[in-house]
């Protein structure tokens, strides 16, 4: 057999025995001649250096580059590969020789009284016990001890090969201290040398430090670092630590094996580094290295040592946070400190507790920010050891995209009498206030919804070509008043008004308000009618449980068939876009109402009376009249708003006050409610009567006591009452100083 790569024009050495395998008997002489084309050498089993005394290699007498190998009286141990090769090349010819020695069927290693086999306990691994045979076809079994077990080749994972040895899954013999091969020849047993079984591993899966990061201490505290190495079974570990102050007096290192669950394929080692009282010089990188000989793994962590406990705010701590309504707001408390501080949040001085809308921890989180969340938030950091406190104020500004108040009305589709002057209003609430409110318009017929046009709830008017109000050609003459600012419902609002000089044309008007965080718009249907006219008696806005009459007045010579309807709830989304369409063209959504007809010399008056008006009575009321000549129907729509009854409340408190004799006292008591409450004043629970020194103004809202006297001292009560109840506030007025004596005395 030949091995190696061919060199240029060099043939393989030729052996005198032209076989791959030669079998000879023990005690006979083995002689093989090798011829080649350049200097040759021989290699034989159990000897790589050529110092074996029994083996003789001689130059051939009959030619150059020829060597004969001779071994007289061969023994079983001479079994193996004999190789003739050219010096300095890989070119060689090999013959495998079996020396059949039935008294010694196994080839013994020259140097070993016993061998060593290394195994791992992995179920998938096999191990080869190198008990080579001097006879190729022996029946060989493997004996393991203790306890004694015998393994026989099974044609699968257990096998014996005379050139290789005995192959067996390593876990089968991992319990054993030693193994040997045994051959049976003619009922006689022959054993190989003993092999010591060494179960080894070397793999380090990982090295984990605990704590793994963010380790902070102050001078004098104890540092404990645990380093855990996870390895495969039968691994030994050397631990080594690197740390800043190597000459530490109070350093303690403890290494130990950790117990793992039985059946675990893993082993754990723990090394614990303890420094009893750290100093500043102990600050730095701590590295734990685990070494198994064939592998090293390490892990590091940084330990920070502070001179003493402290707390401070980090440079990234914000002072102003801006957000838009509905957003999630996160305000992190950025701090430097050891140990970590206790964190408490306050809003306008009141402690914040976590709930489903707000989380007050390291990060103050407001889930869905609203206007009422605007304010100053104070975060107070307290060092748990030194009790040192640091506070920082964060101003939260919540922006509101423009909201137009009138949009909340049910359906602003009032009709306007031809030729009249009308004012349209957009009341805008926005934070910051809108930087502009613009008005646009469009003719009603250009915008009336055709069936083919798609309409959505979000855009009920399919109008594309909005025109600026400066361009009022073909429309009504318009004037936009300067924006006004008003405090409405406790909020600063911007009021934009558009004055239509003469209502000549039906149109749609749109106001659009824009601020830094968004925009809002309102579309107003301005339907002009020459038809009937609606008035409300006695009030424009009744309160619930009051009575109200809707009067529809029409010229009797022009109109007939006056009828009252109420606009029903519109089925969405089909009719949403039809609001600007004259209501007369769409009677499907109208409910006919009972009414009473009166006449005078020129007009018919149809009166629809609502007794004890309720919130359900709110909505759009339609008066329909028919032209006597053309039979064309004319509609007028009026929106009725019914104010909710609200029990009296008094805004603001009366303050206790001390006044000197002869001075004046002025206090006010502002009450709200619907119906509006009556305000009364009491002194020491008796009705306060006006006289020259006691003045009540503005519906008793303001009380003035001029040139106070000692007898004006007492408990003053402001009481606001309506049919829904009373509300009251009290204050004690103290009058100081001596009463001047009068001449009468």
């Amino acid at each position: 057999a030949s091995v190696g790569l061919p060199s240029v024009s060099l043939d393989l050495p030729r052996l005198s025995i032209q076989k791959d395998i030669l079998t000879i008997k023990a005690n006979t002489t083995l002689q093989i001649t090798c011829r080649g084309q350049r200097d040759l050498d021989w290699l034989w089993p159990n000897n790589q250096s050529g110092s074996e005394q029994r083996v003789e290699v001689t130059e051939c007498s009959d030619g150059l580059f020829c060597k004969t190998l001779t071994i007289p009286k061969v023994i079983g141990n001479d079994t193996g590969a004999y190789k003739c090769f050219y010096r300095e090349t890989d070119l060689a010819s090999v013959i495998y020789v079996y020396v059949q020695d039935y008294r010694s069927p196994f080839i013994a290693s020259v140097s070993d009284q016993h061998g060593v086999v290394y195994i791992t306990e992995n179920k998938n691994k096999t191990v080869v016990i190198p008990c080579l045979g001097s006879i190729s076809n022996l029946n060989v079994s493997l004996c393991a001890r203790y306890p004694e077990k015998r393994f026989v080749p099974d044609g699968n994972r257990i096998s014996w090969d005379s050139k290789k040895g005995f192959t067996i899954p390593s876990y089968m013999i991992s319990y054993a201290g030693m193994v040997f091969c045994e051959a049976k020849i003619n009922d006689e047993s022959y054993q190989s040398i003993m092999y010591i079984v060494v179960v080894v591993g070397y793999r380090i899966y990982d090295v984990v430090l605990s704590p793994s990061h963010g380790i902070e201490l102050s001078v004098g505290e104890k540092l404990v670092l645990n380093c855990t190495a996870r390895t495969e079974l039968n691994v030994g570990i050397d631990f080594n630590w690197e740390y800043p102050s190597s000459k530490h007096q109070h350093k303690k290192l403890v290494n130990r094996d950790l117990k793992t669950q039985s059946g675990s394929e893993m082993k754990k080692f723990l090394s614990t580094l303890t420094i009893d009282g750290v100093t500043r010089s102990d600050q730095g990188l701590y590295t734990c290295a685990a070494s198994s000989g064939l592998m090293t793994k390490k892990n590091s962590t940084f330990v920070r040592v502070h001179e003493k406990p402290f707390v401070a705010f980090g440079s990234g701590m914000e002072s102003l946070v801006e957000a838009t309504v509905g957003e999630r707001v996160r305000i992190p408390a950025k701090y430097l400190g050891y140990p970590p501080p206790e964190i408490k949040w306050y809003k306008n001085g009141i402690p914040l507790e976590s709930n489903h809308t707000i989380k007050a921890g390291h990060v103050l989180t407001i889930m869905e920010v609203s206007e009422r969340d605007t304010g100053n938030y104070t975060v107070i950091l307290t060092n748990p050891i030194s009790k040192e406190k640091q506070s920082h104020v964060v101003s939260l500004v919540v922006y509101v995209p423009p909201q137009i108040g009138e949009k909340s009305l049910i359906s602003p589709v009032d009709s306007y009498q031809y030729g009249t002057t009308q004012t349209l209003t957009c009341t805008v609430y926005a934070i910051p206030p809108p930087h502009h409110i613009h008005w646009y318009w469009q003719l009603e017929e250009e915008c009336a919804n055709e069936p083919s046009q798609a309409v959505s709830v979000t855009n009920p008017y399919p109008c594309e070509e909005w025109r600026s109000v400066e361009d009022f050609q073909g429309g009504n003459k318009i004037e936009v008043n300067k924006n006004q600012f008003a405090l409405i419902e406790g909020k600063n609002k911007t009021v934009s008004t558009l004055v239509i000089q003469a209502a000549n044309v039906s149109a749609l008007y749109k106001c659009e308000a824009v601020n830094k965080v968004g925009r809002g718009e309102r579309v107003i249907s301005f339907h002009v009618t020459r038809g009937p006219e609606i008035t409300l008696q006695p009030d424009m806005q009744p309160t619930e449980q009051e009575s109200v009459s809707l009067w529809c007045t029409a010229d009797r010579s022009t109109f007939e068939n006056l009828t009252w309807y109420k606009l029903g709830p519109q089925p969405l989304p089909i009719h949403v876009g039809e609001l600007p369409t004259p209501v007369c063209k769409n009677l499907d959504t109208l409910w006919k109402l009972n009414a009473t007809m009166f006449s005078n010399s020129t007009n018919d008056i149809l009166i629809m009376e609502l007794k004890n008006a309720s919130l359900q009575d709110q909505g759009d009321y339609v008066c329909l009249a028919q032209d006597r000549k053309t039979k064309k129907r004319h509609c007028v729509v009026r929106q009725l708003t019914v104010l909710e009854r609200v029990a009296p409340t008094i805004t603001g408190n009366l303050e206790n006050q001390t006044t000197s004799i002869g001075e004046s006292i002025e206090v006010s008591c502002t009450a709200s409610g619907n119906p509006p409450p009556q305000i009364m004043w009491f002194k020491d629970n008796e009705t306060l009567v006006e006289d020259s020194g006691i003045v009540l103004k503005d519906g008793n809202r303001n009380l003035t006591i001029r040139r106070v006297r000692k007898e004006d001292e007492g408990l003053y009560t402001c009481q606001a009452c309506s049919v829904l109840g009373c509300a009251k506030v009290e204050a004690f007025f103290i009058i100081e100083g001596a009463q001047e004596k009068t001449n009468l005395e």
Epitope: V127, S291, T296
Partner: antibody, heavy 117, light 110 residues
Framework: QVQLVQSGGGLVKPGGSLRLSCAAS????????MNWVRQAPGKGLEWVSS????????YYADSVKGRFTISRDNAKNSLYLQMNSLRAEDTAVYYC??????????WGQGTLVTVSS | LPVLTQPASVSGSPGQSITISCTGT?????????VSWYQQHPGKAPKLIIS???NRPSGVSNRFSGSKSGNTASLTISGLQADDEADYYC??????????FGGGTKVTVL
């Protein structure tokens, strides 16, 4: 930076002895396993021996077992290979190498050992 | 001497990709994800270019990549350059607590 500087190579007769040294710098020598790898002239690399950081665990290739001894001195940041009963087939360039998560993440420059009569 | 089997030589033109295989048994390459690859220029010490089958140490070009399937590991050099001409060796741990190297592959850039 990591440096491994070798010394101790030379010519020796078959059966003779030689001691190779490897001086380490640029890393914490006492934390790492170390090994020796050799390369016969014109041939491939062959692993020779490994030693754990505190010398608790030592491994050898079968071809050198019983003849070579690996050792280290962490105080001197040095690794050694004592080679006895040298044979012609031990002729090679010997490299010391650091054992990281793999067998040789940094290598020395190599030193030639020639065994010849 | 048992070694992992590598092709004796592989060649490619500049810019091409080449792959070197390294075949062992389930006792070495197949058994562990601990195959490494080394580059050795003539007269120089080997240099680690891939560890743990496919991890590239910092400073090694991303043109070198490693993979493994069964008992065979592979090193791929993409965008071949003149400086890639060198010997390449694989190695693996074995179940016998030893380390095996491949026979080496000479890479020639045409």
């Amino acid at each position: 930076q990591v440096q491994l500087v070798q010394s101790g190579g030379g010519l020796v007769k078959p059966g003779g002895s030689l001691r190779l040294s490897c001086a380490a710098s640029g890393f914490t020598f006492s934390s790492y396993s170390m090994n020796w790898v050799r390369q016969a002239p014109g041939k491939g690399l062959e692993w020779v021996s490994s030693i754990s950081s505190s010398s608790s665990y030592i491994y050898y290739a079968d071809s050198v077992k019983g003849r070579f001894t690996i050792s280290r001195d962490n105080a001197k940041n040095s690794l050694y290979l004592q080679m006895n009963s040298l044979r012609a087939e031990d002729t090679a360039v010997y490299y010391c190498a650091r054992v990281g998560a793999t067998m040789g993440d940094y290598w020395g420059q190599g030193t030639l050992v020639t065994v010849s009569s | 001497l048992p070694v992992l089997t590598q092709p004796a030589s592989v060649s490619g033109s500049p810019g091409q990709s080449i792959t070197i295989s390294c075949t062992g048994t389930d006792s070495d390459v197949g058994g562990y994800n601990y195959v490494s690859w080394y580059q050795q220029h003539p007269g120089k010490a080997p240099k680690l270019i891939i560890s743990d089958v496919s991890n590239r140490p910092s400073g090694v070009s991303n043109r070198f990549s490693g993979s493994k399937s069964g008992n065979t590991a592979s090193l791929t050099i993409s965008g071949l350059q003149a400086d890639d001409e060198a010997d390449y060796y694989c190695n693996s741990y074995t179940v016998h607590a030893t380390v095996l190297f491949g026979g080496g592959t000479k890479v020639t850039v045409l």
